[in-house]
Interface confidence: low
Amino acid sequence: SGVFQLQLQEFINERGVLASGRPCEPGCRTFFRVCLKHFQAVVSPGPCTFGTVSTPVLGTNSFAVRDDSSGGGRNPLQLPFNFTWPGTFSLIIEAWHAPGDDLRPEALPPDALISKIAIQGSLAVGQNWLLDEQTSTLTRLRYSYRVICSDNYYGDNCSRLCKKRNDHFGHYVCQPDGNLSCLPGWTGEYCQQPICLSGCHEQNGYCSKPAECLCRPGWQGRLCNECIPHNGCRHGTCSTPWQCTCDEGWGGLFCDQDLNYCTHHSPCKNGATCSNSGQRSYTCTCRPGYTGVDCELELSECDSNPCRNGGSCKDQEDGYHCLCPPGYYGLHCEHSTLSCADSPCFNGGSCRERNQGANYACECPPNFTGSNCEKKVDRCTSNPCANGGQCLNRGPSRMCRCRPGFTGTYCELHVSDCARNPCAHGGTCHDLENGLMCTCPAGFSGRRCEVRTSIDACASSPCFNRATCYTDLSTDTFVCNCPYGFVGSRCEFPVGLPPSFPW
C-alpha cells in the first residue's frame, strides 16, 4: 500500500489557446486530470488501473502552482494504491479549459482539451522527487513525482506491513525496511518477550514486563536464585526447592532435632566435660569437687567419704584429713592393726582372716558397705541414670525415673514412636521430640496417612495464556494444552502467533 504523488509546479500557455489552436474566451481557465495505470509501452486508451485524480481550476493561461491546497485542491496530488508497487507505471496528464463551473468529464466538450502528455517508465519507492518538463508546440508543463509507502507499509515495493505498537501483541517501532525495532526492555521476533531484570535466573525466574523478576514456585530472592527450603525447616538449608539439609549438629525432617546439645547449649558447669548422648541428651563428667546432672553443685572433699573404717573426715584448705579410729592408720585409715579376733565387722558382717591373720576382710550383708560394713548403701551416689533420669532409693534397691522419650532400667533407651509403624499406606514415619510425624505418599493425607485423596494437579491453575489443563490421574501430574501461539510445559512462552504481519 502506498501513494503516487504528483506535484504540479508551472504551466505555460502564453497564447491562451486550446489544443485545437482556438483561443479560450476570455482566457484558458485551466484544470488538470491525471490518470495513473500499469506500464504500457505505448500508452493506450483504457481504464486508469492505478487510479485517477482531478484538480479544481488552478489558474488562467500561464501560472505557477503553490505547494498546498489551491481552491480546494491538493498539491501534491495523491494517487493511493493498495497493492505491491510494481516499480513501473504509465502516467497521463491532461490540461483542460473550464468554460463554466461543472468540471465533470461528461459536462465538458471534447475540444476543451488544452494539452495531453503521457509518460511511462520505472520508478522506485523513495522520498526523492523526480523533476520532469514536457513541452508541446504551444504549452509547457513542469512537474515532479514520487512513490512513497502509506503509513505502516515499508520495503522496496511497500509490501511489508509494520504498525508500531506497544500492547499485548508487541512492543516495537518500525525500521525503514519494515523490520521491527523492539522498544527498550523487549525482545523476540515480535518484541513480545520482556527482558527480565538483569541477572534474573533463566529457569527459576520469569517476567511479564521489562526489568521484572518473578520467581517460579520454590525460588525466592531479587534474582530468583535462592531456593525456598521445606516449610518449617529450622536449622537447615537447600540447594533445590523444598529441601531441608541440616546444619552441623541438627537432625530430623525439619532439622529441629538437636544432635549437638553440648555445643548449642553448653549445659555443663564448672569446667565439666560434656558428651552428646543422643537427641537433646548429654552427660556431664564433673571435675573433682563438683556434682549434679550439670556439675552445678560444689562438693566438700569430705562429701565423697574418703575415710575408711569409720575414720572421721576433716576439711582442710588444701584437701582433707582422716582421723582414724583405734586399730587403723593410713591416709584414708585403710590399713588395719586389727584382726578377726577384735570383731571388726559391723552390721552382721562376716570376718575373713588374710595374710596369716595379719589382716582381715569383712563380707557385708546387703545394704551395707565399707571395709568394716559400717556404711549403709546409697545406691544413687554413682548417678546411674542416663539422659537426665532421676535416681530414687527404694530400700534395698534403686530405681530410675526417666524423662519423656527415654526408657530402660537406666533410661538408656530412646523411645521410638515409630516402632509400631503408625503411618498407613506406605507413609514415612519421623520421630519428633514430642511425638511423631507421617509424610504421606501422593494420594493420601491425614495425621496417619489414613485419608485417601484424589489429587487435582490442575487446582492451582498452573497453565498460562488461557491454556486448558488436564490432570493425569495415573501420575497425579498436569498437562497443559496450549492455545495457538504458545508453547512450554505451562504454555508460558509465546511463539509470536497469531502473527501481526504478512511476511
Epitope: L161, S208, A459, S461, C469
Partner: antibody
Framework: QVQLVQSGPGLVKPSQNLSLTCAIS??????????WNWIRQSPSRGLEWLGR?????????DYAVSVKSRITFNPDTSKNHISLQLNSVTPEDTAIYYC??????????????WGQGTTVTVSS | DIQLTQSPLSLPVTPGEPASISCRSS???????????LDWYLQKPGQSPQLLIY???SRASGVPDRFSGSGSGTDFTLKISRVEAEDFGIYYC?????????FGRGTKVEIK
C-alpha cells in the same frame, strides 16, 4: 458506534445447510483489534459459543468442538460482513443465533455489542 | 471445558430490594496477572444479551452503579443494590479464560 445486523432464513430443512449473515457498521471486519463471535441459544443448551473469526494479516478461526466439522465462517471485506455456514443441520440446531464483537484490548476481550439474533428452526 | 454453575435459577425480587446472584466455576478463572476472566450479561425479554460487567467487577459503559461484581478464583457474585423495573430479565455469567467460552445456565430475576 459499532452495530451488528443479522439476516438469514428462519426455517431450514434437516440435512440442508444453514447460512446466516452479520453486517458490521462502525468498524471494519478486517480490523486487527476485533474478533467476530457466533453464539447460539436454545432451551436445551442455553447459551452456546460456536466460534470466532479474526484478521491478523490473514484470517484465523476458532471453532467449538461440537460443530467443528460442520461450521465455516466467511468474512467479506467488500461488504464488511461475516457469514456463518452450518452444514447438514438437524433439529438439534434449532436455536437463536447471535453474532457478537469481541474487542481485543491489551488484557481482555469481551462480547459487546451483540446482533439482534436470528431465530432458526430446523424442521421438515 | 470449564463449567459455570449459577444459583439460584430463579430469583423473585420486590423493586427497591437488593438481589444477589452466585456463579461458581469448575476451575479457577484467576491468571497470574491478577485478573479473573469472568463477565456478566443481562438478557431482557425478547432482546439479545448485553454486557453488564467484565473482569469480575468492571462495569461496562452506561451500566448504573447499583450493579457490582465481586469474587476470585472459582466463586463470583453479582449484586444489585436496589432492583429497578428495567433490571428484570435473565443474568448470565461467562468465562473468557479459554476457548470455548462457556456460559452459566442463567438466573431469572422476576417481580415478586
Amino acid at each position: 458506534q459499532v452495530q451488528l445486523v443479522q439476516s438469514g432464513p428462519g426455517l431450514v430443512k434437516p440435512s440442508q445447510n444453514l447460512s446466516l449473515t452479520c453486517a458490521i457498521s462502525g468498524d471494519s471486519v478486517s480490523s486487527d483489534s476485533a474478533a467476530w463471535n457466533w453464539i447460539r441459544q436454545s432451551p436445551s443448551r442455553g447459551l452456546e459459543w460456536l466460534g470466532r473469526t479474526y484478521y491478523r494479516s490473514k484470517w484465523y478461526n476458532d471453532y467449538a468442538v461440537s460443530v467443528k466439522s460442520r461450521i465455516t465462517f466467511n468474512p467479506d471485506t467488500s461488504k464488511n460482513h461475516i457469514s456463518l455456514q452450518l452444514n447438514s443441520v438437524t433439529p438439534e440446531d434449532t436455536a437463536i443465533y447471535y453474532c457478537a464483537r469481541e474487542g481485543d484490548n491489551w488484557n481482555y476481550g469481551w462480547l459487546d455489542p451483540w446482533g439482534q439474533g436470528t431465530t432458526v428452526t430446523v424442521s421438515s | 471445558d470449564i463449567q459455570l454453575t449459577q444459583s439460584p435459577l430463579s430469583l423473585p425480587v420486590t423493586p427497591g430490594e437488593p438481589a444477589s446472584i452466585s456463579c461458581r466455576s469448575s476451575q479457577s478463572l484467576l491468571l497470574s496477572n491478577g485478573y479473573n476472566y469472568l463477565d456478566w450479561y443481562l438478557q431482557k425479554p425478547g432482546q439479545s444479551p448485553q454486557l453488564l460487567i467484565y473482569l469480575v467487577s468492571s462495569r461496562a459503559s452506561g451500566v448504573p452503579d447499583r450493579f457490582s461484581g465481586s469474587g476470585s478464583g472459582t466463586d463470583f457474585t453479582l449484586k444489585i443494590s436496589r432492583v429497578e423495573a428495567e433490571d428484570f430479565g435473565i443474568y448470565y455469567c461467562m468465562q473468557a479464560l479459554q476457548t470455548p467460552y462457556t456460559f452459566g445456565r442463567g438466573t431469572k430475576v422476576e417481580i415478586k
